[in-house]
Amino acid sequence: ELCDDDPPKITHATFKAVAYKEGTMLNCECKRGFRRIKSGSPYMLCTGNSSHSSWDNQCQCTSSAARNTTKQVTPQPEEQKERKTTEMQSQMQLADQVSLPGHCREPPPWENEATERIYHFVVGQTVYYQCVQGYRALHRGPAESVCKMTHGKTRWTQPQLICTGETEPSQFPGEEEPQASPDGLPESETSR
């Protein structure tokens, strides 16, 4: 079941997942000047069976100016800078990361995608927080948030993290060692 809200916002911090639970949706958003191809799906969906999970549908963007063409443009240097969030997500995906049952990995970028990814998370998803560059983490507990539910009421737990002005960025907890999710599995990354 989908979580009603977005994960909590922490000042000077970003969050991500390490893997996405089946049922998670990722909007097919395009950057300015581009739009989703007419026949294209509005979102990608993490689906699977007992042994394997993957993203259904592929996002495709086409120039808003062009008609019925899927010609895609290589991002220029200034556009690449714009894509920092998505690139950070891609870098987080370790090649040797073990696939988790019932989970999808971070989908690879698609050409001309928007700078920010919008996920629709499902109950049981864990996201991990880290302070942005220039801020240091003060932990009172785990820097993670879980989407929990009881009979249709969903809520994200509050991450125990404060980011204070410093010089070095902190690690994502998921990068240091896997953390247990409500399903007893380490979860995965997301930014919204």
Partner: antibody
Framework: QAYLQQSGAELVRSGASVKLSCTAS????????IHWVKQRPEQGLEWIGW????????EYAPKFQGKATMTADTSSNTAHLQLSSLTSEDTAVYYC??????????????WGQGTLVTVSA | DVVLTQTPLSLPVSLGDQASISCRSS???????????LEWYLQKPGQSPKLLIY???NRFSGVPDRFSGSGSGTDFTLKISKVEAEDLGVYYC?????????FGGGTKLEIK
């Protein structure tokens, strides 16, 4: 494996209060909602309420408002149910249970063994 | 409050027979999110209840496929295709769609 261990049976005087505990192992209670259920001798199940241990938010069935108070201590992974101004009507087994969710299920999948509260005159 | 009425109160069966328990609600128990949080629990003597079925028709892990749930709106049914000795006990339906959640009165499955 998730498990809920409840405190032992209580014999209490009419008018007094009692505090029951429910300690979880195998999972963090802050990531779930903990519910309490009452069962009077030879009778059915009655939902008392739930607590969100992460922030202390609670929801009570109207008939248990003022009678029951749910609290939680995440440091000990324990939920508590306090019953006040006890009468013979409160003589029952009290269960804690967790609303558990996974890729393919959601419901009260794990229950404590129950605590029998006997109210004496 | 939503009232769940279970029938029959007592259900005597022979082992190997099919058993059917009805649960009717006083109002629709479709949640505002479109889901129907109707569950079935079995409580054996001296034990805590155990989850059998969630969201009307989904079997919980480890529950034998002789148990099946069906229904919609206000009318729900639990069927046991071939009753075994370990199935004896009291069955409760439960709705979590409306606050406060409520249990049915229970149906005792016993040997004829």
């Amino acid at each position: 494996q998730a498990y809920l261990q409840q405190s032992g049976a209580e014999l209490v005087r009419s008018g007094a209060s009692v505090k029951l505990s429910c300690t979880a192992s195998g999972f963090n209670i802050k990531d779930y909602y903990i519910h309490w259920v009452k069962q009077r001798p030879e009778q059915g199940l009655e939902w008392i309420g739930w607590i969100d241990p992460d922030n202390g938010e609670t929801e009570y069935a109207p008939k248990f408002q003022g009678k029951a108070t749910m609290t939680a201590d995440t440091s000990s992974n324990t939920a508590h149910l306090q019953l006040s101004s006890l009468t013979s009507e409160d003589t029952a087994v009290y269960y804690c249970t967790v609303f558990w969710y996974g890729n393919n299920y959601a419901g009260f999948a794990y229950w404590g063994q129950g605590t029998l509260v006997t109210v004496s005159a | 409050d939503v009232v769940l009425t279970q029938t029959p109160l007592s259900l005597p069966v022979s082992l190997g027979d099919q058993a059917s328990i009805s649960c009717r609600s006083s109002q629709s128990i479709v949640h505002s999110n479109g889901n129907t949080y109707l569950e079935w629990y079995l409580q054996k003597p001296g034990q805590s209840p155990k989850l059998l079925i969630y969201k009307v028709s989904n079997r919980f892990s480890g529950v034998p496929d002789r148990f099946s749930g069906s229904g919609s709106g206000t009318d729900f049914t639990l069927k046991i295709s071939k009753v075994e000795a370990e199935d004896l006990g009291v069955y409760y339906c439960f709705q979590g769609s409306h606050v406060p959640p409520t249990f049915g009165g229970g149906t005792k499955l016993e040997i004829k």
